[in-house]
C-alpha cells in the first residue's frame, strides 16, 4: 500500500520552512521545490528484499522519526 | 538509471581536462549530478555537482579551477579542470544521490586522466 | 568541511568472520531526524557501490549480512560473516552538507 509522504522534523536543527503537499524540502539549497526535481523514488518491486525507508522530506508536521527509520513510506507524490 | 563517462586519458600539463557524463533513463532536470575523483590508490574526493535547476557546487579546494556545465537536450554534463599538473591523475566519476538522502546510488564506471607530457 | 576519520586503515580477515569498521566525523551528521551518513563497498578498477545510507538503511541488492548502525558522530559498518566476495574496501561518506566528505578508506584483505 502506498502512502503519502510522511514528515521528517530536526533533532538538531530548526524546521525548514514548511513545504505543500506538491513540495519536497531539498537540504541543499534549504527551501522547498517541487518534488519531480528531485530524484525522488520509485516503487520498489513486490518482494525486494531490501527496506525502502525513502520519503519525501517535508517537515510540516513533526512525526517523531528515528534516523533512518526502517518503516517510513515511500513518497505518494510520483 | 545508467551513467557513462567519456573524454580523453591523457591531458598535458597546464591544460584543461574535460570529461562527459551521458545520462540515460533520468532526465538530467531532476536530481543532483555530481563528480567524484579518486587518485591511484588513495581515496575519493568530492569535486561537485550540478543540481536539476543548473546551479552548481564546486568542493573549495578545487573551485578555482572546476566548471561543471549541462547540456539538457543530450542530457549529459561536463567537468572542465584548468591548469592540471600529475595530481590531477586520477579515476573521475560521475554520480547522482537518493532523495531525501542524498546517498550516490548510481554511478558510472569511471574514467582514467593521466597528466603528464 | 567535516572531515571522516575511518579505523581501521586496513584489516585481515577469515571468511565468516565478523568485521566491523568504523567511522567518525568531526561534528554531527544528523539533520531533520536522518543521519547522513552512507558506507561503499569499492573494488579493484570499479566504482563505488551503495552498502548502506542512512546510518542503517541496506542499499539495493545489498546482502543481508551487512548493517550499519549510529548517530551523531560515530558509526559502524558491520560484516556478520565475511564472505569472499567481501574483500574490498569499505568508505564512509556524509552527505548532511557539502562538500560531501569521504573517510580515507577501510581495506579488508583475506588473512
Known amino acids: 500500500m502506498r502512502r503519502g509522504p510522511r514528515s521528517l522534523r530536526g533533532r538538531d536543527a530548526p524546521a525548514p520552512t514548511p513545504c505543500v503537499p506538491a513540495e519536497c524540502f531539498d537540504l541543499l539549497v534549504r527551501h522547498c521545490v517541487a518534488c519531480g526535481l528531485l530524484r525522488t523514488p520509485r516503487p520498489k518491486p513486490a518482494g525486494a528484499s531490501s527496506p525502502a525507508p525513502r520519503t519525501a522530506l517535508q517537515p510540516q508536521e513533526s512525526v517523531g522519526a528515528g534516523a533512518g527509520e526502517a518503516a517510513l513510506p515511500l513518497p505518494g507524490l510520483l | 538509471v545508467q551513467l557513462q563517462e567519456s573524454g580523453p586519458g591523457l591531458v598535458k600539463p597546464s591544460e584543461t581536462l574535460s570529461l562527459t557524463c551521458s545520462v540515460s533513463?533520468?532526465?538530467?532536470?531532476?536530481?543532483?549530478w555530481n563528480w567524484i575523483r579518486q587518485p591511484p590508490g588513495k581515496g575519493l574526493e568530492y569535486i561537485g555537482y550540478?543540481?536539476?535547476?543548473?546551479?552548481?557546487y564546486y568542493n573549495p579546494s578545487l573551485k578555482s579551477r572546476v566548471t561543471i556545465s549541462r547540456d539538457t537536450s543530450k542530457n549529459q554534463y561536463s567537468l572542465r579542470l584548468s591548469s592540471v599538473t600529475a595530481a590531477d591523475t586520477a579515476l573521475y566519476y560521475c554520480a547522482s544521490p537518493n532523495y531525501p538522502f542524498y546517498a550516490m546510488d548510481y554511478w558510472g564506471q569511471g574514467t582514467r586522466v593521466t597528466v603528464s607530457s | 568541511d567535516i572531515v571522516m576519520t575511518q579505523s581501521p586503515s586496513s584489516l585481515s580477515a577469515s571468511v565468516g568472520d565478523r568485521v566491523t569498521i568504523t567511522c567518525r566525523a568531526s561534528e554531527s551528521v544528523d539533520n531533520y531526524g536522518i543521519s547522513f551518513m552512507n558506507w561503499f563497498q569499492q573494488k579493484p578498477g570499479k566504482a563505488p557501490k551503495l552498502l548502506i545510507y542512512a546510518a542503517s538503511n541496506l542499499g539495493s541488492g545489498v546482502p543481508s549480512r551487512f548493517s550499519g548502525s549510529g548517530s551523531g558522530t560515530d558509526f559502524t559498518l558491520t560484516i556478520s560473516s565475511l564472505q569472499p566476495e567481501d574483500f574490498a574496501t569499505y568508505y564512509c561518506?556524509?552527505?548532511?552538507?557539502?562538500?560531501?566528505?569521504f573517510g580515507q578508506g577501510t581495506k579488508v584483505e583475506i588473512k
Open positions: 550540478i543540481s536539476y535547476s543548473g546551479s552548481t
Open positions: 561518506q556524509q552527505s548532511k552538507e557539502v562538500p560531501w566528505t
Open positions: 533513463g533520468d532526465s538530467i532536470t531532476s536530481g543532483y
